[in-house]
Structures are given as structure tokens and as C-alpha cells.
Amino acid sequence: SCNTATCVTHRLAGLLSRSGGVVKDNFVPTNVGSEAF
């Protein structure tokens, strides 16, 4: 899958949306590598 910074950001936004925002505080694009997905 796509591992560019923009792809990671959009994937994380989708994950946050689906989880209702209930994730760890440090779960942000610049802390999350593509392996998290």
C-alpha cells in the first residue's frame, strides 16, 4: 500500500473517524509509520 506522508495522513484520518477519535494521544501522522496500518 501507499506509504507516502500524504497517504499515511489520509489513512490515519479515516481510522480516527471510524474509531470516533478514541485513540492514543500520540497517534498522529508524524508519529505513525506505514507499518501501523
Partner: antibody
Framework: EVQLVQSGAEVKKPGASVKVSCKAS????????MNWVRQAPGQRLEWIGD????????NYNQKFKGRATLTVDKSASTAYMELSSLRSEDTAVYYC????????????WGQGTTVTVSS | DIQMTQSPSSLSASVGDRVTITCKAS??????VAWFQQKPGKAPKSLIY???YRYSGVPSRFSGSGSGTDFTLTISSLQPEDFATYYC?????????FGGGTKVEIK
């Protein structure tokens, strides 16, 4: 309110360097990547590179590798793009841009900085 | 680098018209495409990400579709404020690349 405010217009001579700043506010600066894009007069947009303000990791367009340097000052929530060995073809408007998730999911852009390279 | 070829490069249309702009990638970019609107002297404004998702605040008359190599931006009913230049961008691979733009002019 999320804002990206860039430094003012610059006029440089060929061979010189320019450093453009982008001051971020309204969100956590270190949480999101910062992109730099330029647009020469009448031309398409051109991606220069991105920087992770958290660990200062960078990705560059090979076209600018060695001439462009992306840096950040975390304490000032400011990103910088320095371009060296300027030539007339570098005359363009330079933009910073960042896709933010919190507080608002949107792709925010700075207002642009005009860099003119002329002898 | 991935080439993004936009067509047409310009078009003339009237208020209320349906406008379609296409973008073709030189290789598969999945759905990792964005669309931007730019007015003279202004920064680009983001409209669409992931080929078909509108950012909050973007009017519903703007829609995007496509995957792989072929993408489309549609304006269902052109409004006076929509006359501008539109760009596609792929962010599937570094370096990110943009299409050459489509200028939408008043007929």
C-alpha cells in the same frame, strides 16, 4: 483557526540563496507533515519536498535534491525552505501546505511567497 | 516520475453547465489523487482527496471519481465562483506530481 503565514516577497540575483519561512498556528505543528510546492509563471504546480517536523525526516523531489533544504524550528512552529544556486527558472511563487486532521480535517496552504531571480 | 496528463487544457462553459475534467496517470496510483482549484494570484484550494472524497466545506456540486490511471472531476452545475484553473495531483509515489491544469472560462 489554522493558519500558515509565509514570509514576504524576495528578489535575488542568480547564484544566490533564498530562505522562505512558513509560520504555523492553530494546530500542533509537530503532528503533521509540511509540504513545499512552487509554481512558476503560467506553469503547473511542482512539489519540492516534505518534512516531518517531529523527527525532521525529509523527502525531496530529485529535481531539487542538493539545492533545496527543508528545516523546522519546533519552538517557533515554523518551517523553512531554502533554495540555493538560484537561476532565472526558479522565479516562482513558493507555497507551504499541510494536511491537518485536528481541529479540522483539511489541506491548508500558505498565501505564497514570490521569489524573483534576476540580474 | 509519474506523469499526470489533464484534459482539456481549457474549456468554455456557461453558468449551470455540467463540466467534466479528466486526468490520466502514467502508471497505477490506486485512488491516491487529489483535485485543487486555483484562482489568479491565489493559493490552490483543496477540493477532493483519495479520488472521490470532498473536504469539509466543499460544495456537493464537486465530485471526483476514478482509480488506477483514470480520474475525473465533475462540477454538476457550474457557478460563477467556479471559473478557475483546476489541477489534479497524485500522491501515491514520490515525487508527488500535478497535472498541467484545466482553465474553466466563461462562454
Amino acid at each position: 483557526e489554522v493558519q500558515l503565514v509565509q514570509s514576504g516577497a524576495e528578489v535575488k540575483k542568480p547564484g544566490a540563496s533564498v530562505k522562505v519561512s512558513c509560520k504555523a498556528s492553530g494546530y500542533t505543528f509537530t503532528d503533521y507533515y509540511m509540504n513545499w510546492v512552487r509554481q512558476a509563471p503560467g506553469q503547473r504546480l511542482e512539489w519540492i519536498g516534505d518534512i516531518n517536523p517531529n523527527n525532521v525526516g525529509t523527502n525531496y523531489n530529485q529535481k531539487f535534491k542538493g539545492r533545496a533544504t527543508l528545516t523546522v524550528d519546533k519552538s517557533a512552529s515554523t518551517a523553512y525552505m531554502e533554495l540555493s544556486s538560484l537561476r532565472s527558472e526558479d522565479t516562482a511563487v513558493y507555497y507551504c501546505a499541510s494536511i491537518i486532521i485536528v481541529p479540522n480535517y483539511f489541506d491548508y496552504w500558505g498565501q505564497g511567497t514570490t521569489v524573483t531571480v534576476s540580474s | 516520475d509519474i506523469q499526470m496528463t489533464q484534459s482539456p487544457s481549457s474549456l468554455s462553459a456557461s453558468v449551470g453547465d455540467r463540466v467534466t475534467i479528466t486526468c490520466k496517470a502514467s502508471q497505477n496510483v490506486d485512488t491516491n489523487v487529489a483535485w485543487f482549484q486555483q484562482k489568479p494570484g491565489k493559493a490552490p484550494k483543496s477540493l477532493i482527496y483519495s479520488a472521490s472524497y470532498r473536504y469539509s466545506g466543499v460544495p456537493s456540486r464537486f465530485s471526483g471519481s476514478g482509480s488506477g490511471t483514470d480520474f475525473t472531476l465533475t462540477i454538476s452545475s457550474l457557478q460563477p465562483e467556479d471559473f478557475a484553473t483546476y489541477y489534479c495531483q497524485q500522491y501515491n509515489n514520490y515525487p508527488y506530481t500535478f497535472g498541467g491544469g484545466t482553465k474553466v472560462e466563461i462562454k
